[in-house]
């Protein structure tokens, strides 16, 4: 009988071993090895038994020792099993953005590698396993499906295999894959809420604001909004799972009309947009005119106001008549009319919204001087001694400055509070005097002495 | 309008000497008129003032040796008696209360007398 | 009676520098108070009237204040042409006075 030791070889590819051959008698007719491996007789052998080297092992074989006793021929084969790790372990590429909510699908391939019976594949995330598969064919290709949440944004998922020949070999084989990181995106199905005058008038500053709740991750998203060809440079803020993106737009003539605002929200792989309709109008306001800003009391004025053709417009609350773009009356010029304001509104309907626009002119009527004898009495009897204060008011537009001297050098001290004496009593006369000219009125004042009363 | 004196120079103690101020552009039914003097390198003193009516009023220490009296068109200043302390420039002046700020600065351009034996 | 005290008699200044001239009244004159300005051997020629009231041509560094009895002059930033005398007058009442006018502040601008 022919014995072979070690009946069963674990060795690495390309790795030598040792294999004793031997026969059951003392002195065999022949003993000797049958394999297509390179060999190599390690002398001295002994009188029943041989011991040969066998090198660069590629792949598993069974070598034969025969040995020829005079009660016969046998044989005895070694197991030769050849270990080697995968060449090639790889994750594919995952998809650059991934909805949360949907199954991802991990694929990984594994070239070479043996003995494949103690090969296992595994897909990973970070550290934790996902799956666990024999590996089976050449490439050996495994997958796994996995639901995905937003805290896989930025994880790490990848592939690794583990050759394990415990007992025979003490060690574990790993070989992994380069990590992928995952980037997941949630956005919701609901579009941007887009706020923004749906009225813009010409060289006015509107703001536009579009806003969307439900971001995943929020910092990632990219906003987009335009008025019709004009990009608008938004200020973005960022919540925890909403932005709200604020931009202000100025509009020309040359954008009259309506116009389209768009804001996109885009995250990952995919868009949201909001459209909305804003008319772009142009409203000068209306123009007030009076035949002269300045004019001297008694003078017609003609009060007129013209507006845009579409607009209507009131002067000073009352309506054109008939309804219409322009509006006028006539008026004789007062003292009382100094300073009134004319006031024209007008209001226009655009896009179904009514934007009004007003215009004020003050009419300045010049008049006077005036003395009257309500505002400056031409006579006052005052107790010697007694604390009194004349009074004496000039009317007109320009003011007219006012002075009162008796005999043209004493002046009466006008709105002050004096001590009567007797040096107050005569007539003065005051004079009243503007650009417009100048008017005079006599004031006597009489002190009474305490002997009289 | 304008104011000027005449009728300054030397005069000896104890005479008698009449100041004449004429006045153009303007009527002295309309304004009271005044009469100032400065004696060499002092200050400016005030003697009186005849009203648009014709009243006279005098600085207390002038009354007596003063008198002022006005025509249509001219205001006098009578010196009776003159001492060599009466010797100065003296200035005709138009009540600054004339006319509403503009005409506060009508002095004439002063006449000198001189007293001295 | 309404007569008039003026301080200080004489005050020096640098260019630039300012001047504060006072003017007292014996009885209340309002704001019927003139100030002028009296170079030699010219007659006095008018800077404020009303107390306040900046009569024309007359630069803004010159500014009047004061009603009643008590009357400033104040003369900021001043300048070489600014050498003169300076007289206030009340301009209340003609009788009862012994004199009209201050005394007279004499500026010497170094």
């Known amino acids: 009988q022919t014995s072979v030791f070690p009946p069963e070889v674990i060795l690495p590819r390309g790795g030598s071993v040792k294999v004793n051959c031997s026969a059951s008698c003392d002195q065999p007719i022949s003993l000797g090895m049958e394999t297509p491996l390179p060999k190599k007789e390690i002398l001295p052998g002994g009188n029943n038994w041989k011991m040969y080297e066998l090198s660069n092992v590629q792949e598993d074989s069974q070598p034969m020792c025969y040995s020829n006793c005079p009660d016969g021929q046998s044989s005895a084969k070694t197991l030769l099993t050849v270990y080697w790790t995968p060449e090639r372990v790889e994750l594919a590429p995952l998809p650059p953005w991934q909805p949360v909510g949907k199954n991802l699908t991990l694929r990984c391939q594994v070239e070479g590698g043996a003995p494949r019976a103690n090969l296992t594949v595994m897909l990973l995330r970070g550290e934790k396993e996902l799956s666990r598969q024999s590996a089976v064919g050449e490439p050996a290709e495994v997958t796994t499906t996995v639901p995905v949440g937003r805290d896989d944004h930025g994880a790490n998922f990848s592939c690794r295999t583990e050759l394990d020949l415990r007992p025979y070999v003490l060690k574990l084989f790993e070989n992994t894959s380069a990590p992928h990181q995952l980037q997941t995106f949630d956005l919701p199905a609901t579009p941007p809420q887009l706020v923004s005058p749906q009225v813009l008038e010409v060289d006015t500053q509107g703001t536009v604001v579009c806003s969307l709740d439900g971001l995943f991750p929020v910092s990632e998203a990219q906003v987009s909004l335009a008025l019709g060809d004009q990009k608008l440079n938004p200020t973005i803020t960022y919540g925890n799972n909403s932005l709200s993106a604020k931009a202000s737009v100025k509009v020309t003539a040359e954008e009259e009309g309506t116009q389209q605002l768009l804001c996109g929200v885009m995250l990952g792989n995919q868009t949201q947009e909001t459209r909305q309709t804003v008319t772009i109008y142009s409203f000068p306001a209306p123009n007030v005119n009076l035949t002269k800003p300045e004019v001297s009391e008694g003078t017609e004025v003609i009060v007129e106001c013209e507006a845009h053709p579409r607009a209507k417009v009131m002067l000073n609350g009352v309506p054109a008549q008939p309804p219409g773009p322009r509006a006028q009356f006539l008026l004789k010029a007062t003292p009382e009319d100094n300073g009134r304001s004319f006031s024209c509104s007008a209001t226009l309907e655009v896009a179904g919204q009514l934007v009004h626009k007003n215009q004020t002119r003050e009419l300045r009527v010049l008049y006077g001087p005036r003395l009257d004898e309500k505002d400056c009495p031409g006579n006052w009897t005052w107790p010697e001694n007694s604390q009194q204060t004349p009074m004496c008011q000039a009317w007109g537009n320009p003011l007219p400055q006012l002075k009162c001297l008796k005999d043209g050098t004493f002046p009466l001290p006008i709105g002050q509070s004096v001590t009567v004496t007797r040096d107050l009593e005569g007539t003065y006369l005051c004079q009243a005097r503007s650009t417009r000219g100048e008017v005079t009125r006599e004031v006597t004042v009489n002190v009474l002495s305490p002997r009289y009363e | 309008q304008s104011v000027e004196e005449s009728g300054g120079g030397l005069v000896k103690p104890g005479g008698t000497l009449t100041l004449t101020c004429t006045v153009s552009?303007?009527?002295?039914?309309?304004?009271?008129m005044g009469w100032v003097r400065q004696a060499p390198g002092k200050g400016l003193e005030y003697i009186g003032i005849?009203?648009?009516?014709?009243s006279t009023y005098y600085a207390s220490w002038a009354k007596g040796r003063f008198t002022i009296s006005k025509t249509s068109t001219t205001v006098d200043l009578k010196i009776t008696s003159p001492t060599t302390e009466d010797t100065a420039t003296y200035f005709c002046?138009?009540?600054?209360?004339?006319?509403f700020g503009d005409g506060y600065r009508l002095w004439g351009p002063g006449t000198l007398v001189t007293v001295s034996s | 009676a309404y007569d008039m005290t003026q301080t200080p008699a004489s005050v020096e200044v640098a260019v630039g520098g300012t001047v504060t001239i006072k003017c007292q009244a014996s009885?209340?004159?309002?704001?019927?108070l003139l100030w002028y300005q009296q170079k030699l051997g010219q007659r006095p020629s008018l800077l404020i009237y009303?107390?306040?009231k900046l009569a024309s041509g007359v630069p803004s560094r010159f500014k009047g204040s004061g009603s009643g009895t008590e009357f400033t002059l104040t003369i900021s930033g001043v300048q070489s042409d600014d050498a003169a005398t300076y007289y206030c007058?009340?301009?209340?009442?003609?009788?009862?006075?012994?004199?009209?006018f201050g005394g007279g502040t004499e500026v010497v601008v170094k």
């Open positions: 552009g303007f009527s002295l039914s309309s304004y009271a």
């Open positions: 007058q009340q301009a209340y009442s003609s009788s009862n006075v012994d004199n009209a």
């Open positions: 009303d107390a306040s």
């Open positions: 002046v138009r009540d600054p209360y004339d006319s």
């Open positions: 005849i009203g648009s009516s014709g």
């Open positions: 009885e209340n004159i309002y704001r019927y």
